[in-house]
Amino acid sequence: HKCDITLQEIIKTLNSLTEQKTLCTELTVTDIFAASKNTTEKETFCRAATVLRQFYSHHEKDTRCLGATAQQFHRHKQLIRFLKRLDRNLWGLAGLNSCPVKEANQSTLENFLERLKTIMREKYSKCSS
């Protein structure tokens, strides 16, 4: 069957987000991938979206991320814009209303996005073959 257009959009967004690192991609998030063996695919997408939502809700107005100049402010707005897009598309793919995120493990946002990209690319390769 054909790959969902939403999946393609997620991969495209992740490709952009992982092109470059920035100050706030080095901040930590809950690592839902550390022990996700008994988790369905839809739950994984839902939990990933939850983690991203927690991150941008918490850091959208974080002065460490906003920086001191218009240029730094633009960069942070760019990060938040892409994370919101990713969150929205992951919810669409998950099709679930809510899901718990209870893990204690942490990873940087940067590593979280890289891991999510790997998972999404694997899914894409299966549905496109």
């Epitope: 495209k12 952009s16 987000l17 920035t22 100050l23 100049t69 218009a70 240029q71 960069r75 760019q78």
Partner: antibody, heavy 118, light 107 residues
Framework: EVQLVESGGGLVQPGGSLRLSCAAS????????MHWVRQAPGKGLEWVVW????????TYADDFKGRFTFSLDNSKNTAYLQMNSLRAEDTAVYYC???????????WGQGTLVTVSS | EIVLTQSPATLSLSPGERATLSCKAS??????AAWYQQKPGQAPRLLIY???HRYTGIPARFSGSGSGTDFTLTISSLEPEDFAVYYC?????????FGQGTKVEIK
């Protein structure tokens, strides 16, 4: 594949005007900022302007405020640099460059030569 | 406007040697410094952004370091294709500015 193609350069007399175009392809145009950078013959790089492609808001280097206007046509994925009151010292290769998602300029066009001479 | 001063203007080295290029800013740009390589007749190419992060596809022999006002680009072992002009650039604040360039030439 990301591509930026400039056009519109050429010979113009002092005091004249020219409009440069930069056609972008291979990515979502409004996701990345766009810049113009110029390089006079045998000289270094000089940043001219950047534009937030989402809002259309440009930010100019002081030397170019008033004379140069950066605009977009998002439907054509194209950026324009309108240059008025051109002087001999504006003679340069003009590059458009895509702003990296956060930093720097990650893709550049091949450049278009503008020569201001009588 | 933040002025970037690069040194030396020209660096004459042989393939295999280590190249160290310096860039000094007139005021702090924190870590918002980038490096570009430009060869004759070509557009510049982004090598390093955010002081020390190699851009996609850039070989590991290129590295960046520094913070505040002093930045360094190091090429650990020069390859024939590395002989070019290198520019530092700050994107801490507008106007973005470039250094005047350092030419790395074959000795």
């Amino acid at each position: 594949e990301v591509q930026l193609v400039e056009s519109g350069g050429g010979l113009v007399q002092p005091g004249g005007s020219l409009r440069l175009s930069c056609a972008a392809s291979g990515y979502t145009f409004t996701d990345y900022s766009m810049h113009w950078v110029r390089q006079a013959p045998g000289k270094g790089l000089e940043w001219v302007v950047w534009i937030n492609t989402e809002t259309g808001e440009p930010t100019y280097a002081d030397d170019f405020k008033g004379r140069f206007t950066f605009s977009l046509d998002n439907s054509k994925n194209t950026a324009y640099l309108q240059m008025n009151s051109l002087r001999a010292e504006d003679t340069a290769v003009y590059y458009c460059a895509r702003g990296g998602i956060f930093y720097g300029m990650d893709y550049w066009g091949q450049g278009t030569l503008v020569t201001v001479s009588s | 406007e933040i002025v970037l001063t690069q040194s030396p203007a020209t660096l004459s080295l042989s393939p295999g040697e280590r190249a160290t290029l310096s860039c000094k800013a007139s005021q702090s740009v924190i870590n918002d410094a980038a490096w570009y390589q430009q060869k004759p007749g070509q557009a510049p190419r982004l090598l390093i952004y955010y002081t020390s992060h190699r851009y996609t596809g850039i070989p590991a022999r290129f590295s960046g370091s520094g913070s505040g006002t002093d930045f360094t680009l190091t090429i650990s072992s020069l390859e024939p294709e590395d002989f070019a002009v290198y520019y530092c650039q700050q994107d801490y604040t507008s106007p973005w500015t470039f250094g005047q360039g350092t030419k790395v030439e074959i000795k």
